[in-house]
């Protein structure tokens, strides 16, 4: 039995798929080295409200994304969101759940921004 | 172990086009773009532009554009940057860089360097 | 395109001195960012991808953080061996783009 989740494919997109001479969309093969682990990701940009995916496919090995089965943002408003997870084409879905800084309690608790998925 | 091997040092008249080879060893060659950096004397690097061996597909900077021309021999897993109507300012290092499969792309071997001088 | 800038262009230090380079992007480029060492007459080595994971045989003193537009390159205990010119380099979108360097000298 794996003590991981090994990730042997992901969605592949790119939004800027005519200049960078690529495909545009489809499944990407993560091949490596054994020694090495492979993930998938997901870069997204939020323009008004409007979520515009920007690249998927297999990212280098990346400790950021160990034992992540879910594509999760979690900094606050980024300019540019990033996920990344182990596990076959597991970056088909993308969420943003931002991490709260823990500051004072307050009286009113803060909610936490709603998600975006894919 | 992976190597790049690039060809030796050329001295050009301005106006006149040079072309640089790779020769990449130890890898599938089609399997990983190579890209073209330069290095004036003296000075930082300067993105060129990259092929896929695999496709022949290219890439260049807007800066290159007419005068480059990038492509590749996958027999003998050779890749090769022409640069033509050479100017002084032209005189650099130029370098092949194989990058790695996956994303964030980073370029992960190195040729050791071809000197380009351009001078009348 | 976008810029990369670098800071400092230059700095001196002495072995076993923590040396902080940083890389500030024109505009967001997430963690598609590497860090290169290269020393004179040489080809430039890789250092670190993806903002902060270290390449394959480079030592742990090594190491890199940020996201978005500012980054960090820091040397923890600067060896002789690591006196050099360190880039930083961008491949989120094209044009590829590198800062302009620093070159970190003996005090």
């Known amino acids: 039995i794996l003590g991981r989740s090994e990730t042997q494919e992901c969605l592949f997109f790119n939004a800027n798929w005519e200049k960078d001479r690529t495909n545009q969309t489809g499944v990407e093969p993560c091949y490596g080295d054994k020694d090495k682990r492979r993930h998938c990701f997901a870069t997204w940009k939020n323009i008004s409200g409007s979520i515009e995916i920007v690249k998927q496919g297999c990212w280098l090995d990346d400790i950021n994304c160990y034992d992540r089965t879910d594509c999760v943002e979690k900094k606050d408003s980024p300019e540019v969101y990033f996920c990344c997870c182990e596990g076959n084409m597991c970056n088909e879905k993308f969420s943003y759940f931002p991490e709260m800084e823990v500051t004072q309690p307050t009286s009113n608790p803060v909610t936490p921004k709603p998600p975006y998925y894919n | 172990q992976v190597q790049l091997v690039q060809s030796g040092a050329e001295v050009k008249k301005p106006g006149a086009s040079v072309k640089v080879s790779c020769k990449a060893s130890g890898y599938t060659f089609t399997g990983h773009k190579m890209h073209w950096v330069r290095q004036a004397p003296g000075q930082g690097l300067e993105w060129m532009g990259w092929?896929?061996?695999?496709?022949?597909?290219?890439n260049y900077a807007q800066k290159f554009q007419g005068r480059v021309t990038m492509t590749r021999d996958t027999s003998i897993s050779t890749a090769y940057m022409e640069l033509s109507r050479l100017r002084s300012d032209d005189t650099a290092v130029y370098y092949c860089a194989r990058v790695s499969m996956y994303a964030p792309e980073p370029m992960d071997v190195w040729g050791q360097g071809t000197t380009v001088t351009v001078s009348s | 395109d976008i810029q990369m800038t670098q800071s400092p262009s230059s700095v001196s230090a002495s072995v076993g001195d923590r040396v902080t380079i940083t890389c500030r992007a024109s505009q967001g480029i997430s963690r598609w960012l590497a860090w290169y060492q290269q020393k004179p007459g040489k080809a430039p080595k890789l250092l670190i991808y993806?903002?902060?994971s270290l390449q394959s045989g480079v030592p742990s003193r090594f190491s890199g953080s940020g996201s978005g537009t500012d980054f960090t390159l820091t040397i923890s205990s600067l060896q002789p061996e690591d006196f050099a010119t360190y880039y930083c380099q961008q491949a989120f979108s094209h044009p590829w783009t590198f800062g302009g360097g620093t070159k970190v000298e003996i005090k």
């Open positions: 993806a903002a902060s």
């Open positions: 092929i896929n061996p695999a496709s022949g597909w290219t």
